[in-house]
């Protein structure tokens, strides 16, 4: 730099007013936004900047200091006396660090020519800024025709009265951008053509979209593109313990802003989002799916002692169906229904009860009716089978009553009413049911179906049969009706308390038709189908124990 002897520089001591004002103004402006990466900031360089003034008596560095006596690199030129000024200030080489578009922020004071005394005639109010790309750190070239003009810089607020105002110096700030850059670095140059300028700060930076976590995806620092309208698509990577089914992307704008987010990451099962990270679910909490937002407290009757639980374990004697989501409470089989009552008539049995005291914790209680037919003599019961109809149904009954149609008459039934829910079949414990014992009323018996011929002679026929399938009560007697074939109107009735009879006084070699019915206290049943038997001829032998089909 030019010699400072005899010039108006601040001595490197004491709190110089102008310097303090500059410092205060600069300090407030010193912090760069997070999307700007400085390649050069003359305010932060402690030693020699290594800039060159050409000619030597043009730009001069003035020794401003801040309150800590750290130097501020301020370059001043005020060659307003002489015509045809052409003073150059050349920076050292500046690496562009891979950026293809850079920004130059100048802070300067530019004195209004009107504030200078009349008679100067050469005063200007602008200066020029140039750049020169180079891969060579030592290739500073002071031939001005090598440099490309960036712009002519004028003050937005050139202070006519050197306006320090309320002791706060107004610095003009101008920002220009340059691109696309193709080499490793560049030099800047400032050309004075006869202005009165103090160049207080030169900051060269590029813009980046700063590393950010958005929607649980990490997007890395991304240098903006060379084109001022360019959007760079950047893929994000999911933060720890997160997953995606829609890969996250964002677009980095030329201004260093993240735009147009696409896709997202979600905290995986067992983790929840907190402050942009996936935090483990605490014991007692779970998250079953990445699509859930937060860890939830274990549902009723379940627990987890682990971190990062994706489900909770059911307490002892509590269960969850496989089809149940992990968010559902664990339940246990309900207790038995209560206060079951029956009402019997000739054609049906009506049962009614109230719900169990303990539903097991769920709302899905239904009822199952098990019908057992019991032999009163032997005390042995067997399932009723298909002869009973249940109205409305036997299984999955939602209401607390059921009607059984077509029960057998004069039969001992045990109806077991069991309350069930979705986990009843998972429980190894005993069934919980209430029993109702019912004896149906007697009814006319069903027809006799199985008749066997016994001894047949020329004048008699002996028969035997089995009790009807459904006696529907106690068989008091059987009535046997028989007649000679085709002589139906002339029939004979025999009554018998046994299941065998012998019809006597029959004609030899004649066909007889037999029909049998049983009687209970409720009355006679219908006659059986017709059974035909033939007496033997006079000379024939007797025939016994042949079953008539």
């Amino acid at each position: 730099p030019a010699s400072l002897a005899g010039c108006y520089s601040a001595p490197l001591k004491g709190p110089l007013w102008t310097c303090l004002l500059l410092c205060a103004a600069l300090r407030t402006l010193l912090a760069s936004p997070s999307n700007e990466v400085n390649l050069l900031d003359s305010r932060t360089v402690l030693g020699d900047l290594g800039w060159i003034a050409f000619p030597k008596n043009g730009w001069e560095e003035i020794g401003e200091v801040d309150e800590n006596y750290a130097p501020i690199h301020t370059y001043q030129v005020c060659k307003v006396m002489e015509q045809n000024q052409n003073n150059w200030l050349l920076t050292s080489w500046i690496s562009n660090e891979g950026a293809s578009r850079i920004f130059i922020e100048l802070k300067f004071t530019l004195r209004d020519c009107n504030s200078l005394p009349g008679g100067l005639g050469t005063c200007k109010e602008t200066f020029n800024m140039y750049y020169f790309e180079s891969d060579d750190e030592n290739g500073r070239n002071i031939k001005d025709n090598q440099y490309i003009k960036i712009d002519t810089i004028a003050a937005d607020e050139s202070f006519t009265e050197l306006d320090l105002g309320d002791r706060v110096m107004k610095l003009n700030t101008e920002v220009r951008d340059v691109g696309p850059l193709s080499k490793k670095g560049f030099y800047l140059a400032f050309q004075d053509v006869g202005a009165c300028i103090a160049l207080v700060s030169v900051r060269v930076y590029y813009k980046k979209c700063p590393s950010v976590v958005r929607h649980l995806a990490v997007f890395p620092d991304t240098i903006t593109g060379a084109d001022s309208s360019q959007l760079l698509e950047v893929s994000g990577s999911c933060v720890n313990h997160s997953v995606t089914d829609d890969p996250p992307k964002m677009h980095c704008s030329a201004e260093g802003e993240w735009l147009v987010p696409i896709g997202k990451c979600m905290c995986k099962a067992g983790y929840e989002e907190k402050n942009g990270t996936c935090q483990v679910c605490r014991p007692g909490f779970f998250k079953a799916s990445p699509h859930s937002q937060t860890c939830s407290k274990c549902p009723p009757h379940s627990y987890t002692h682990e971190e990062a639980s994706t489900s909770c374990v059911c307490e002892k004697d509590y269960f969850r169906r496989e089809s149940d989501p992990p968010t559902m409470a664990c339940t246990r089989p309900p207790s038995a229904p209560r206060n079951a009552i029956s009402n019997v008539n000739e054609t049906s049995v009506f049962l009614e009860w109230i719900p169990p005291a303990d539903t097991g914790g769920g709302k899905d209680v239904s009822y199952y009716i098990l019908c057992k037919k019991c032999n009163s003599h032997a005390g042995v019961c067997e399932e009723c089978g298909g002869h009973v109809r249940y109205l409305p149904q036997q299984i999955g009954l939602k209401n607390t009553s059921v009607m059984m149609a077509d029960p057998l008459a004069h039969t001992n039934y045990t109806f077991e009413i069991e309350a069930v829910n979705g986990v009843s079949d998972l429980s190894p414990g005993t069934r919980q049911y209430v029993s109702v014992n019912v004896t149906t009323n007697q009814a006319a018996p069903s027809p006799v179906t199985n008749v066997k011929k016994g001894k047949i002679a020329k004048n008699s026929i002996s028969l035997s049969w089995q009790e009807p399938d459904r006696p529907n009560g106690i068989i008091l007697e059987y009535e046997i009706k028989y007649f000679e074939k085709d002589q139906e109107t002339s029939y004979t009735i025999i009554k018998s308390k046994e299941t065998t009879i012998t019809a006597e006084g029959l004609k030899p070699a004649s066909v007889y038709v037999f029909q049998i019915r049983a009687r209970t206290a409720a009355g006679y049943g219908v006659f059986s189908r017709r059974f035909e038997f033939e007496t033997t001829p006079v000379f024939g032998a007797s025939n016994d124990q042949s079953q008539i089909p």
Partner: antibody, heavy 121, light 106 residues
């Protein structure tokens, strides 16, 4: 080092003329303006005006037009103050002072030792 | 023409004491003000320009402030060599001096 050298004292009669030289050294003469300041005996400083050493263009303060002329000889880095038709009230020490213009302000940073001009009959 | 009025005309202080000199302009001169020191038989010496900026080699016991019409020069601890006459001067299209303040030994 930078200095301005003025001539010794002058005694003149009323109506006469005087030409006070101010020789600069230690810097480029044409890069700084030159100002003239008058100080009457026992009085304060009075700015007379200045001359652009690059263009030769002078600027005069109120009350210093007509009889007062600023001039230059850049070949010898010298500025001149010429006063014609001298009057008794022109008796004073006349200082040349180099003017420095900066973005932060202006000032006369280097002064000559002064030339006493006495006008007496 | 802008008139500068300095006060007091004379200021008597003891060495080591603080001295405060005032300069008032008839109209705003913003910060276009300089201060000079003149000792008997010597040329003036530039102390401050731009209302508050030290010239080269000026001790930091001298400080100045103000803008617009009211300006102050302060000598924090007067040294024996500081006894002199102090002038303020405004600069713009036309320049003028104040009438001066004499700082003398008390």
């Amino acid at each position: 080092q930078v200095q301005l050298l003025q001539s010794g004292a002058e005694v003149k009669k009323p109506g006469a003329s005087v030409k006070v030289p101010c020789k600069a050294s230690g810097y480029t003469f044409t890069s700084r303006a030159m100002s003239w300041v008058r100080q009457a005996p026992g009085q304060g400083l009075e700015w007379m005006g200045w001359i652009n050493t690059n263009t030769g263009n002078p600027t005069y303060a109120q009350g210093f037009t007509g009889r007062f002329v600023f001039s230059l000889d850049t070949s010898v880095s010298t500025a001149y103050l010429q006063i014609s038709s001298l009057k008794a009230e022109d008796t004073a020490v006349y200082y040349c002072a180099r003017v420095r213009f900066t973005v932060y302000g202006d000032g006369m940073d280097v002064w000559g030792q002064g030339t006493l001009v006495t006008v007496s009959s | 023409e802008i008139v500068l009025t300095q006060s007091p005309a004379t200021l008597s202080v003891s060495p080591g004491e603080r001295a405060t000199l005032s300069c008032r302009a008839s109209q705003s001169v913003s910060s276009n003000l300089a201060w000079y020191q003149q000792k008997p038989g010597q040329a003036p010496r530039l102390l401050i320009y731009g209302a508050s900026t030290w010239a080269t080699g000026i001790p930091d016991r001298f400080s100045a402030s103000g803008s617009g019409t009211d300006f102050t020069l302060t000598i924090s601890r007067v040294e024996p060599e500081d006894f002199a006459v102090y002038y303020c001067q405004q600069y713009g299209p036309s320049w003028t001096f104040g009438q001066g303040t004499k700082v003398e030994i008390k």
